[in-house]
Interface confidence: low
Amino acid sequence: EAHKSEIAHRFKDLGEQHFKGLVLIAFSQYLQKCPYEEHIKLVQEVTDFAKTCVADENAENCDKSIHTLFGDKLCAIPKLRDNYGELADCCAKQEPERNECFLQHKDDNPNLPPFQRPEAEAMCTSFQENPTSFLGHYLHEVARRHPYFYAPELLYYAEKYNEVLTQCCTESDKAACLTPKLDAVKEKALVAAVRQRMKCSSMQRFGERAFKAWAVARMSQRFPNAEFAEITKLATDVTKINKECCHGDLLECADDRAELAKYMCENQATISSKLQACCDKPVLQKSQCLAEIEHDNIPADLPSIAADFVEDKEVCKNYAEAKDVFLGTFLYEYSRRHPDYSVSLLLRLAKKYEATLEKCCAEGDPPACYGTVLAEFQPLVEEPKNLVKTNCELYEKLGEYGFQNAVLVRYTQKAPQVSTPTLVEAARNLGRVGTKCCTLPEAQRLPCVEDYLSAILNRLCVLHEKTPVSEKVTKCCSGSLVERRPCFSALTVDETYVPKEFKAETFTFHSDICTLPDKEKQIKKQTALAELVKHKPKATEDQLKTVMGDFAQFVDKCCKAADKDNCFATEGPNLVARSKEALA
C-alpha cells in the first residue's frame, strides 16, 4: 500500500532504536571513511526529521523517497570531494541514478586498519558509561568494513554484543568472560558478511531469477513438508528482502524481513514443524532464528522423482508450456529430498536437467533421450563428495593452521599473480572450513563445505575484480556462480607464471614478531610461505616443509634469546641463505 510519507511509515514500523541503527549502518556503508561522530550527527538529523513526518505526514519534504532524503544528506557533507574523490560526482545525478552511483562506489576492501578490540576493562568502562554510543561505534565499525553486511542481521549481532557486555562487565575476570564470547560473535558475523556478499553478488551479476532459484533450493531443503506454492511465496519474499538490502534500501529490507518472520510464524502449519521455538522470541532474534532453523523431517512417503520428471510422457509438454514453473518444481522436489546436498550442487543438477530437456525435447524420441538424465547426475554428485572427503582427511591430519598452509600453497600455485595479502586472507578463510564443517555429521558436511567455500571464493572474486591480475581467476569468476567452486578446484599450477625474484628483505624479520598475538604471527609466516611459492612455484611439499620448519625454529630461537635484535640480525641472513639452497 502507498504511504504519504515513506520515512514516517518506516519509523513507525521499526521503532526509533532500530530506525536509528539502520540509518547509521546505511550511512556507514555508503561513506566508509567518515568518522562515527560525523555519521551520528546525520543520523540524529534524519531521526528528528522522521519524527516531524510522523507527527504530520504532510509536512515539507516528508513525501520524498528515502533514497532522496539520504542522498541529499550525504551530498551535503562538507569536503565530500576531498575525502571521497569521484564519489562526489554521484551528487550531480538524480535519483535513482544517484543511489546506483553510490552503490558502485562501495569498497569491499577499504583502506581501514583492522578493527582492534580494546582491553576488557576499557571496553566495560566505555560500555557502562554510554551503552548506546558504544554499540553505535560497533555498528559503524562493522558496517564501514563490510558495506554489504545484511543490515537487520547486523542489528542482531549488536544486540548479542550488548548481551555479552552486560553479562561479562559485572564479572571479576572480565577478559576471561568476554574473550571467548566476543570471539564467537565475531566469527559468526564474519561468516555472515561473506555469505551476504555472495547473495548480493548473485543479485548484481545474475539478477533476481538466479537468486530466487537459490532461495527455492534452500527453502525446500529446510521445509520439505511445505508445498511448492508456499516455497515459491517464501522464496519470492526472501528475494525481495535481499534485493532491498543489497540495493541500500535498509529500512524497507528490515521492515519486510520482520513481516516475513510474522507471516512464517502465523503459517507454521503449512511451512514447518520446527518454527515454534523461534516464534516466541522478539523480532530480531526471531528472524535470525528462522534464518538458521534446522531442517524439518522429510515426509516419509515421497515417491521417486523419476515419476514426474523422467517417466511421465508429458515431460516435454509440461516443460514447454511453463519452463520456469516446471524447472522450479524439479528444483523443489529434488531439494526437499536432499538436505545432504549443497545448494550449489542442487542448482548444478537443475541446470543439467534443463540442458537435457532443451536438447532432448527437440529430438525425435525425447523419452529415450532424457530417460538416463538422473544417472547422468552421478559424476556431478561425486565430485563435491570427493572434495569433502579428501579435504576433511587432510584437515584431520594437519589441523587448522597446517590445513590453511596446504590451501595457501595450492592457491598460490593456481594464481601466483594475486597479491599475497589477498591469497593469505583467502587461504586462512578457506582453511577454516575444516574446523567449521569437517567435525559435523556426514549428512551435513557437503552442504557446509561447498556453500562456505563458494562464499569465500566469491570474496576472492570481488577483490580480484577490483584489480584483475590472473586470467585464470578472471575466467572462474566470470562464469556462473554455481560453477565457481568446481572451476577453482580444477585449476592447476599456472605454467605461464614467471617466478618472482628472490628478495632477501621479503624474508627478513625483526624482534617485533615476538610480541605479536598468535594470529598475527601466523599471518607473518603464511605471508612468507606464499612468497616462497611465488619464488619457486614448483617447490615440492618436502622442500617447503623444510624451509618453513627452519623458519619457525629461527623465530622461536630468536624470540627466546636475551638479545633478540642481535639474534634476528645475525641469524636472519643465514636462514635466507639456507632457504635459497633448500629451494635450489
Partner: nanobody
Framework: EVQLLESGGGLVQPGGSLRLSCAAS????????VAWFRQAPGKEREFVAG????????YYADSVKGRFTISRDNSKNTLYLQMNSLRPEDTAVYYC???????????????????WGQGTLVTVSS
C-alpha cells in the same frame, strides 16, 4: 486430507453445453494441482484438463482443446469444467482429482493423484 465433490453432470444433446463443478474442502484449491479425468464404460481413465497449483497454467487433452475450459474460483474453493460443443464420444463419468504436496503442475497420469471425487455422469445423446 482433501475431500472433492463433483456436480453438474447429466444428459445433453450433441453440440450442447454443460458446466461441471468440483467443491473442495480440507485444502485451498489454489494451492494444489487439480484435474478432470473421465472414464467411459469399458475404457481406461483418461486425462481431460488440469490446472497448476499456485500458478494458473492450464493443460488440455488434444481431444477437448478449444471446446472445454478448466477454471477455478478460489473464493468458493471450487474447480469448474465448462464443456461446449459436446460429442457422443464425450460420454463418461467425469472425476475431479487433486495432488497436493506434489509438484504443483498437472500430470496426465491418474496414479499420481491421491485424492478423487466420486464422479458425475455426463451422457451426450440425441
Amino acid at each position: 486430507e482433501v475431500q472433492l465433490l463433483e456436480s453438474g453432470g447429466g444428459l445433453v444433446q450433441p453440440g450442447g453445453s454443460l458446466r461441471l463443478s468440483c467443491a473442495a474442502s480440507g485444502r485451498y484449491i489454489d494451492e494444489t494441482a487439480v484435474a478432470w479425468f473421465r472414464q467411459a464404460p469399458g475404457k481406461e481413465r483418461e486425462f481431460v484438463a488440469g490446472i497448476g497449483g499456485g500458478v494458473d497454467i492450464t493443460y488440455y487433452a488434444d481431444s477437448v482443446k478449444g471446446r472445454f475450459t478448466i477454471s477455478r474460483d478460489n473464493s468458493k474453493n471450487t474447480l469448474y469444467l465448462q464443456m461446449n460443443s459436446l460429442r457422443p464420444e464425450d460420454t463418461a463419468v467425469y472425476y475431479c482429482a487433486a495432488r497436493p504436496g506434489r509438484p504443483q503442475i498437472t500430470s496426465k497420469v491418474a496414479d499420481l493423484y491421491p485424492y478423487w471425487g466420486q464422479g458425475t455422469l455426463v451422457t451426450v445423446s440425441s
